[in-house]
Amino acid sequence: MKVLQEPTCVSDYMSISTCEWKMNGPTNCSTELRLLYQLVFLLSEAHTCIPENNGGAGCVCHLLMDDVVSADNYTLDLWAGQQLLWKGSFKPSEHVKPRAPGNLTVHTNVSDTLLLTWSNPYPRDNYLYNHLTYAVNIWSENDPADFRIYNVTYLEPSLRIAASTLKSGISYRARVRAWAQCYNTTWSEWSPSTKWHNSYREPFEQH
C-alpha cells in the first residue's frame, strides 16, 4: 500500500482543516488508514483522524482544530496499521480556504435597485472577519449566456445593482463566495443560491 498523491490540506482558519490524498489503488480509508496530527509545541497531544473515502482511491480527513493562530504548525503522520506511509507538516495560516458566506438574500423592494446581502461566515474576533472580499455570481435560469460576476472589494457584505441591468420578467439566481487577500487564500465554496423574479418599471419613452 502506497500513497500516490501526498496529502494536501486547507484550513477554514477557525475549526476544521481538510486533508485529501490518493492511494495507489482502491482503499477502504476508514478501516485501513489513520492520519495522526499534532500541534508543534511542548506537551501537545496527538489527535487521530479517521479518513473517509473520496472516490475509489481517494481519502479525505477532517481535522478538528482549536482557534487557529498564525504560528500554529502541525505534524502529520499517515499510518496503515503499523506502517508509516507518509510524514509531513501543515501550517493552517498558509493554506486557507475561507468558509462560504451564508444567508444570501435578495431585497427587491428598494425602488428599482436590487440589494443583495449575505452574512460574513466568521465571528468578529476571527482575523478573517475584517479581511474578506467577495464575488457575487448572478445568472438567468432561462438564458445560460446571461451570466455575470460582480467583485465586491469592500468589507460590507452587500451589493447594490440597478434592476434594469438585468432583464425584466425573468427569474435569476445569485450566489456568493469569499476570499482573503491578506492570506492569499483560495476562494471559498459558493454559498447556496437564492432565486428571485426580476421585474422593474420600464422608463417611459417619448416619441
Epitope: 475549526s15 509545541f41 473517509e52 478538528l64 482557534d67 468558509r99 444567508n103 465571528p123 474576533d125
Partner: antibody, heavy 115, light 107 residues
C-alpha cells in the same frame, strides 16, 4: 491524561451570585479555548459561554448575556464563570468543556437557584 | 440564532435494529455539526464531528451524514450499550446550539 474539575456550585437564592471554577490538568491550558455548558435536571444540553485561546474573545448564550461572565487565569490553569442575578431557570449542572468542539468534559457542578 | 430541531424526541428500539435520528438546522451550517451521546448520570461524549467524521475510538456502527440543513445519525445495529440520549450540536456560529435530544429506549 486530560482532566477538568469544576467546583463552586451550591444553593443560592434568586438574584444572588455564584462563581464557578474549572481547574484543568493533563494538557497545556493556555493553548485551549474553553466553554461552559449546562444541563437543567431532566433536560437537554445548553451551551452557555466560550472563551478563545487565541484572542480572549468571549461569547454567551442569549439566556445569560449581561448576567454571566466567563474568564480564565492561564497561570492557574483555571476557567471561571461569574454568575450574577441568578434565576430559577439557571438551576442546572454546569460543565466546563474543552475545544475543539467539546472534546473533553468535566464531571459538572450543580447549581440550584431557589428561595 | 440557529435553531436545531431533532427528531424523534424519543424512540423505542431493539438490539440489532437500525436506528436513524435526524437533525434539522434553521439555516445552512455547512458541515459544522457534531453528535454526542449521553448516558444517564454520565457526561456527554462526542461520536461524530464535521457531520460525517467518526470520532477516534467510537465503534464504526455509528455514522453521520448530511450537509447544509439536514443531518442524520445512524446506528447500523443497535447494541445494549447504545441505549442513551443523543444530541446534535451546530458550531457554525455563535451562539452554539444543541438539538433538544433523542432518547433511545429499549423496546
Amino acid at each position: 491524561q486530560v482532566q477538568l474539575v469544576e467546583s463552586g456550585g451550591g444553593l443560592v437564592q434568586p438574584g444572588g451570585s455564584l462563581r464557578l471554577s474549572c481547574v484543568a490538568s493533563g494538557f497545556t491550558f493556555s493553548h485551549s479555548s474553553m466553554n461552559w455548558v449546562r444541563q437543567a435536571p431532566g433536560k437537554g444540553l445548553e451551551w452557555v459561554s466560550y472563551i478563545s485561546r487565541a484572542t480572549g474573545a468571549v461569547y454567551y448564550a442569549d439566556s445569560v448575556k449581561g448576567r454571566f461572565t466567563i474568564s480564565r487565569d492561564n497561570a492557574k490553569n483555571s476557567l471561571y464563570l461569574q454568575m450574577n442575578s441568578l434565576r430559577d431557570e439557571d438551576t442546572a449542572v454546569y460543565y466546563c468543556a474543552r475545544e475543539p468542539v467539546f472534546d473533553y468534559w468535566g464531571q459538572g457542578t450543580l447549581v440550584t437557584v431557589s428561595s | 440564532d440557529i435553531q436545531m430541531t431533532q427528531s424523534p424526541s424519543a424512540m423505542s428500539a431493539s438490539v440489532g435494529d437500525r436506528v436513524t435520528i435526524t437533525c434539522r438546522a434553521s439555516q445552512d451550517i455547512s458541515n459544522y455539526l457534531a453528535w454526542f451521546q449521553q448516558k444517564p448520570g454520565k457526561v456527554p461524549t462526542r461520536l461524530i464531528y464535521a457531520a460525517s467524521s467518526l470520532q477516534s475510538g467510537v465503534p464504526s456502527r455509528f455514522s453521520g451524514s448530511g450537509s447544509g440543513t439536514e443531518f442524520t445519525l445512524t446506528i447500523s445495529s443497535l447494541q445494549p450499550e447504545d441505549f442513551a440520549t443523543y444530541y446534535c450540536l451546530q458550531w457554525s456560529s455563535y451562539p452554539r446550539t444543541f438539538g433538544q435530544g433523542t432518547k433511545v429506549e429499549i423496546k
